[in-house]
């Protein structure tokens, strides 16, 4: 499709101050026929570490346009944005309010995309072209991954460790795709 | 690019199950939607199930449920595909097939080479 | 479960155009059922021309298009060439359960 690149997995946000949005609510759908018994994805936990919550990273909200070619989705689709680093969960608001942020000793933490949800949107084209129906992929949720070799994507590591499971209970999508991102209009962007 | 490699022919008695395996390569298997589709021999196409990205859950056709399960083993990137209480007519070839991980959700854009599995006494 | 409904089969002078239609027993093929559209070829796996009603992919020949037409979904092949001689199928989308067609026979004489 020829989509400019929208953001990059290394690109790191700033986040605004304030507090942290809650994640965009699923998806409503009466789609219950044919689903595996207890389907649906768990919340995912990264952080096998004592304290789930030592790890943290930033979710925010922004709204836009998508495009297909010249045409635009009727109504915005509303994603997250996973700010760039990551750090303990306790520090993350102070430490942003002083302008200060906590960087690991070790390994480097980024707080990427880890789950991916699916939204229909119906397109708008100029010129009286038939509308279009799509199915575009937005970022969910965001986790913190360790970086393993410095500024290398392809070498985000989970804090913990992944074995068979059934899909109904499968780990989400791990990272964005950035090659592929759209010409996308920022609209009241957070 | 997603490639997918699947597991090699099986013959089956009746009653038995069969478990068909799809290798992801070119992107990790968390990355991408999984979907299984057979062919028996001489006829058409048919969806079995896989996984729906708009509400995080895997869903199966009418016709198998119950008996199909669909799984993956992410340290391998390997999604199976079992089928239990086979019969005669479960004789076909199974195929994987996967999203291109774009930005736009497209199904089926890549294929396994496909799996025969005969269900003979 | 729908049924979906194409033509068992359709031949096509070479250098000519051909319809095919994907029809669905719910009612109006639209834009929200995401129609695909597959070429296979015997003895090889199925490989995808169109997708969401019209949008094709990198592999697609121009010569094949797709569009939504009297309440079905069809591909149109334009200057058939001997090599698109293969069974083409349709797929429909009813809300994450997906329905194949039958399949449509193509014959390029």
């Known amino acids: 499709q020829g989509w400019q690149a929208f953001k990059n997995d290394a690109t790191e946000i700033i986040p605004e101050l304030g507090e942290y949005p809650e994640p965009p609510p699923e998806l409503e759908n009466n789609k219950t026929m044919n689903r595996a018994e207890n389907g649906g994805r768990p919340p995912h936990h990264p952080f096998e570490t004592k304290d789930v919550s030592e790890y943290s990273c930033r979710e925010l909200h922004f709204t836009r346009y998508v495009t297909d070619g010249p045409c635009r989705s009727a109504k915005p689709v509303t994603e997250l944005v996973c700010s760039g680093q990551c750090g303990p969960a306790r520090l993350l608001p102070n430490a942003i309010g002083r302008g200060k942020w906590w960087r690991p000793s070790g390994p480097d933490f980024r707080c990427i995309p880890d789950r991916y949800r699916a939204q229909r949107v119906q397109l708008l084209c100029p010129g009286g072209e038939a509308p279009r129906a799509r199915k575009v992929r937005l970022v969910a949720s965001c986790k913190c991954k360790r970086l393993t070799r410095f500024h290398n994507q392809s070498e985000l590591k989970d804090f913990g460790t992944e074995a068979a499971r059934p899909q109904k209970g499968r780990k989400p999508r791990p990272r964005a795709r950035s090659a592929k991102a759209n010409q996308a209009e920022l609209e009241n962007a957070y | 690019e997603v490639q997918l490699v699947q597991s090699g022919a099986e013959v089956k008695k009746p009653g038995a199950s069969v478990k068909v395996s799809c290798k992801v390569s070119?992107?990790?298997?968390?990355?991408?939607?999984i979907h299984w589709v057979r062919q028996a021999p001489g006829k058409g196409l048919e969806w079995m199930g896989g996984?729906?990205?708009?509400?995080?859950?895997?869903i199966y056709a009418q016709k198998f449920q119950g008996r199909v399960t669909m799984t993956e083993d992410t340290s391998t990137d390997t999604a199976y595909m079992e089928l239990s209480s086979l019969r005669s007519e479960d004789t076909a070839v199974y195929y994987c097939?996967?999203?291109?991980?774009?930005?736009?959700?497209?199904?089926?854009?890549?294929w396994g080479q496909g799996t025969l599995v005969t269900v003979s006494s | 479960q729908a049924v979906v409904t194409q033509e068992p089969s359709l031949t096509v002078s070479p250098g000519g155009t051909v319809t095919l239609t994907c029809g669905s027993s719910?009612?109006?093929?639209?834009?929200?059922?995401?129609p695909y559209w597959f070429q296979q070829k015997p003895g090889q796996a199925p490989r995808t021309l169109i997708s969401?009603?019209?949008d094709k992919h990198s592999w697609t020949p121009a010569r094949f298009s797709g569009s939504l037409l009297g309440g079905k979904a069809a591909l149109t092949l334009s200057g058939a060439q001997p090599e698109d001689e293969a069974e083409y199928y349709c797929?429909?989308?009813?809300?994450?359960?997906?329905?194949f067609g039958g399949g449509t026979k193509l014959t390029v004489l």
């Open positions: 097939a996967t999203d291109s991980a774009g930005y736009w959700y497209k199904f089926f854009q890549h």
């Open positions: 070119g992107y990790t298997l968390s990355e991408l939607s």
């Open positions: 996984f729906d990205p708009e509400d995080g859950e895997t």
């Open positions: 719910t009612g109006a093929v639209t834009i929200d059922h995401y």
């Open positions: 969401d009603t019209d």
């Open positions: 797929l429909l989308d009813y809300g994450g359960s997906f329905v």
